[in-house]
């Protein structure tokens, strides 16, 4: 058993049918010695008397808010949450496996640049009685500061019969140098509590591996005289790290017909312009990627050919 | 990623082309190592990230873009100790900081070259003959060093008398390649920045 926060405790249980559970001793936070009684949640049934209460915690029915009283007055509370260990592996019931970029990915994180700011998000089908708390650091043995905000509900989607909820959090490394070569990964830890169930999820990454630039901005077409060709031009996104000559991007220009089956023409360039043939009803899209470290491509910025 | 390779103009900063080749070569070598050594801990998540140049060179600090010198987090360990001249610099542009930067890059390359050559000698003794260093990568390191053209003491190749532990050598190869790829990215960024200046 360990303390999650004041008066909230997590009991770790080896979770299998007929498991013996864990013996827990609760102590009433009071100078009083006599006439103390204990109850669980809203029940008025007295579970025991005395300054301490010993309970055997086996299932969720044994968890909850234990309260010690004296003469009708509440003295203190202890909330017990359960953390299930199933065959040596901590349960992951609360969050959905996003399966990207690999199985057992519960937290996904992205950064728009090298400033040390990043966003993480996760999915759940649970809509109520759910709280999250997020901590982060650079490295784990001698952790350096990363400040995270509060997790907020950022999207709701309908997936088949289920509703899916997306939560996200923004974090900022306290003293980040965009040009630094990372040798210690960022660690992100999310505590999730649903009703009386506690779970924790972690992710470890280097900022360089989660970079995903914003799409190029100001995408424009300039027809070339007496030709089906057009000059496409664009600019670096505002959110990208500067100077651009140091944090350079490479670009992919795509000409896509109306039908998804039509052959796509693709050109790669380090410049912020390209000459392509504009077909009728086609659209031109451009996306960006760090020129020197192949992390994710940005989303496409698109304009119609007409 | 198959991108069109830009060939530099004669007047262009001479090292840019070499640094692009270096990044391409080390990235290919790392990919090859990860595939060949699939049963070894060779992914970025699994290895310890060590920097053999730590406390010996200060490339990131010495080569910091002017725009980032206002960022206090980038100036924590700005210890620069190299004062030499290199042929990559157009003589008019030769500046103290640029010389320090290029000299630091040269020292990095020299250190990695020694490590890789020592390691290759060990890998050649492996009865499994599982993996060797790409000669193209070693040649590209050499080319960039020649283009930088700094006069520096030659570092003797380390020789080891004890029987090599091939498992450890292969893991060390992975660690070295990951670190060298990160340094090659920095070198490429620096060359691109200097070329634009």
């Amino acid at each position: 058993i360990w303390e999650l926060k004041k008066d909230v405790y997590v009991v770790e249980l080896d979770w299998y049918p007929d498991a013996p559970g864990e013996m827990v001793v609760l102590t009433c936070d009071t100078p009083e010695e006599d006439g103390i009684t204990w109850t669980l949640d809203q029940s008025s049934e007295v579970l025991g008397s005395g300054k301490t209460l010993t309970i055997q915690v086996k299932e969720f029915g044994d968890a909850g808010q234990y309260t010690c009283h004296k003469g009708g007055e509440v003295l203190s509370h202890s909330l017990l949450l359960l953390h299930k260990k199933e065959d040596g592996i901590w349960s992951t019931d609360i969050l959905k496996d996003q399966k990207e970029p690999k199985n057992k990915t519960f937290l996904r994180c992205e950064a728009k640049n090298y400033s040390g700011r990043f966003t993480c998000w996760w999915l759940t089908t649970i809509s109520t009685d759910l709280t999250f708390s997020v901590k982060s650091s650079r490295g784990s043995s001698d952790p350096q500061g990363v400040t995270c905000g509060a997790a907020t509900l950022s999207a709701e989607r309908v997936r088949g019969d289920n509703k899916e909820y997306e939560y996200s959090v923004e974090c900022q490394e306290d003293s980040a140098c965009p040009a630094a070569e990372e040798s210690l990964p960022i660690e992100v830890m999310v505590d999730a509590v649903h009703k009386l169930k506690y779970e924790n999820y972690t992710s470890s990454f280097f900022i360089r591996d989660i970079i995903k630039p914003d799409p190029p901005k100001n995408l424009q077409l300039k027809p070339l005289k007496n030709s089906r060709q057009v000059e496409v031009s664009w600019e670096y996104p505002d959110t990208w790290s500067t100077p651009h000559s140091y944090f350079s991007l490479t670009f992919c220009v795509q000409v896509q017909g109306k039908s998804k089956r039509e052959k796509k023409d693709r050109v790669f360039t380090d410049k912020t312009s390209a000459t392509v043939i504009c077909r009728k009803n086609a659209s031109i899209s451009v996306r960006a990627q760090d020129r020197y470290y192949s992390s994710s491509w940005s989303e496409w910025a698109s304009v119609p050919c007409s | 990623r198959n991108l069109p390779v830009a060939t530099p103009d004669p007047g262009m900063f001479p090292c840019l082309h070499h640094s692009q080749n270096l990044l391409r070569a080390v990235s290919n070598m790392l990919q090859k190592a990860r595939q060949t050594l699939e049963f070894y801990p060779c992914t970025s998540e699994e290895i310890d990230h060590e920097d053999i140049t730590k406390d010996k060179t200060s490339t990131v600090e010495a080569c910091l873009p002017l725009e980032l010198t206002k960022n206090e987090s980038c100036l924590n360990s700005r210890e620069t100790s190299f004062i030499t001249n290199g042929s990559c610099l157009a003589s008019r542009k030769t500046s103290f900081m640029m010389a320090l930067c290029l000299s630091s890059i040269y020292e990095d390359l020299k250190m990695y070259q020694v490590e890789f050559k020592t390691m290759n000698a060990k890998l050649l003794m492996d009865p499994k003959r599982q993996i060797f260093l790409d000669q193209n990568m070693l040649a590209v390191i050499d080319e960039l060093m020649q283009a930088l053209n700094f006069n520096s003491e030659t570092v003797p190749q380390k020789s080891s008398l004890e029987e090599p532990d091939f498992y450890k050598t292969k893991i060390k190869l992975c660690i070295l390649l990951h670190a060298f790829r990160i340094r090659a990215v920095t070198i490429d960024r620096v060359m691109s920045y200097l070329n634009a200046s």
Epitope: E86, K102 | E46
Partner: antibody, heavy 115, light 112 residues
Amino acid sequence: QVQLVQSGGGVVQPGRSLRLSCAASGFTFSSYGMHWVRQAPGKGLEWVAFIRYDGSNKYYADSVKGRFTISRDNSKNTLYLQMKSLRAEDTAVYYCKTHGSHDNWGQGTMVTVSS
Amino acid sequence: SYVLTQPPSVSGTPGQRVTISCSGGRSNIGSNTVKWYQQLPGTAPKLLIYGNDQRPSGVPDRFSGSKSGTSASLAITGVQAEDEADYYCQSYDRGTHPALLFGTGTKLTVLG
């Protein structure tokens, strides 16, 4: 004490269907994940499928994906395995089993797919 | 599709020490705990070892388990005639959990 009693096995022709049941008693069935494991005659153990305690997630071995469906009725304390498009290679003893460091197995039920 | 490899058979005379190995990889045994089962002919498997080296109550202490790196082993000290059975190791793969990964199985023959 924990008990898992299986039923539903038998002889079936290739291409036909069969539903296995596993009735649980002696524990809070709705709190635990459950597996199906099979063993072809003279062969080793092969995992077939898993279902979470609340039925929200199901996982299958590639060899049965799209043909077998694992389900549970927590109000009846029963686990099911619906098997469709049966093949000769599905012939095996099928076991249900609880998920956890200490597990309990059903007695097994024989499924024979033969024409 | 077995990823955990066991020797097909091992044998020993009563009183001898017998070990059965189970070889896997970094993503399974290297990252997860190992269980060992004993299966007597015509019966369901019985749990012998969980959590690499833990014995459930009721399992004789002549059975012991261990794990090192990407391999695990089951040792039976002072093997007895009633130990003649099939033995299976089981673990998980970090990418496919909760799918159970079973070993290929080992037939233990007690001679004499």
